[in-house]
Amino acid sequence: EDELQVIQPEKSVSVAAGESATLRCAMTSLIPVGPIMWFRGAGAGRELIYNQKEGHFPRVTTVSELTKRNNLDFSISISNITPADAGTYYCVKFRKGSPDDVEFKSGAGTELSVRAKPS
């Protein structure tokens, strides 16, 4: 019970093209210390969607204030969804390391499907 778990409550989310997609993720613990990252896909070829620590992600906004003390909600919203955004998104907790952070635990993934824009 005490070990950190990564909760991605929706296994699938369907969004119309042009809309925003909210991908929910929360941690059950503040420990271990380290950043959260969102990826599309798994394995070596996965694509970084959001890095809590650094980087510029113009289409991504965080749902809650990540700098807030004791925040455990790392949900994100991706704007202006297109069919190219379809895929499975993983919320991943990293453990702070030196020189590099180490992947600690991943959520189960949320499959994003994109519907045609209503005419």
Epitope: E1, Q5, V6, I7, Q8, P9, E10, K11, S12, R24, A26, T28, L72, D73, S75, T88, G107, A108, G109, E111
Partner: antibody
């Protein structure tokens, strides 16, 4: 072991609201989805919505959207379901339910309903 | 929303005999991790529902091994190898792949 204790039976007038509580004991409260399921007399089970307290916001079935509010108070390990604009068709037994452990987190299986409350009977009558 | 269809509506059984209930979903409940997000519940008369089978084929804690779940994708079956008198009640399947969770209409199992 995990237990869910629900508030007592209610009799309400059409157009009014009802708020049913569900207190969890045993296990961690914040990390588990609490679902609310209702059963009208002689009818089947109907999922109204659910909340994982750690997120603060709930998911609702479209049928109840705008009429139901599900909340959770982490300080008392209690979930609430409020249904407004009551009509006679809302006469039912309302259950809360939740999973018991986190072993299936890695599978994304959050809405398991291993443990159920005994149900709260809500009667809507003029 | 995913539509769940159960059959039969009513199932008269003889104690000691096997019984089978079918559940069909309007879309596949098989997720990319290989699990089917389909659960089975039994509601005995005057009681709250109780979980029998989760993720398609896994027996819940304390559930007798005469209960088994099978199937994948859109077609699922709950089998009782030898029905006992205490097994009477209404059986429901429910999909847990996505919210809103949706239940089948129920199958009432009664002793002949």
């Amino acid at each position: 072991q995990v237990q869910l204790v629900q508030s007592g039976a209610e009799v309400k007038k059409p157009g009014s609201s009802v708020k049913v509580s569900c207190k969890a004991s045993g296990g961690t409260f914040s990390n588990y989805a609490i679902s609310w399921v209702r059963q009208a007399p002689g009818q089947g089970l109907e999922w109204m919505g659910g909340i994982i307290p750690i997120f603060g916001t709930a998911n609702y079935a479209q049928k109840f959207q705008g009429r139901v509010t599900i909340t959770a108070d982490e300080s008392t390990s209690t979930a609430y379901m409020e249904l407004s604009s009551l009509r006679s068709e809302d006469t039912a037994v309302y259950y809360c339910a939740r999973p018991v452990d986190s072993s299936s987190y890695s599978l994304g299986y959050y809405y398991g309903m291993d443990v159920w409350g005994k149900g709260t009977t809500v009667t809507v009558s003029s | 929303d995913i539509v769940m269809t159960q059959s039969p509506l009513s199932l008269p059984v003889t104690p000691g005999e096997p019984a089978s209930i079918s559940c069909r979903s309007s879309q596949s409940l098989l997720y990319s991790n290989g699990y089917n997000y389909l659960d089975w519940y039994l509601q005995k008369p005057g009681q709250s529902p109780q979980l029998l089978i989760y993720l398609g084929s896994n027996r819940a804690s304390g559930v007798p091994d005469r209960f088994s779940g099978s199937g994948s994708g859109t077609d699922f079956t709950l089998k009782i190898s030898r029905v006992e008198a205490e097994d009477v009640g209404v059986y429901y399947c429910v999909q847990a792949l996505q919210t809103p969770l949706t239940f089948g209409g129920g199958t009432k199992v009664e002793i002949k």
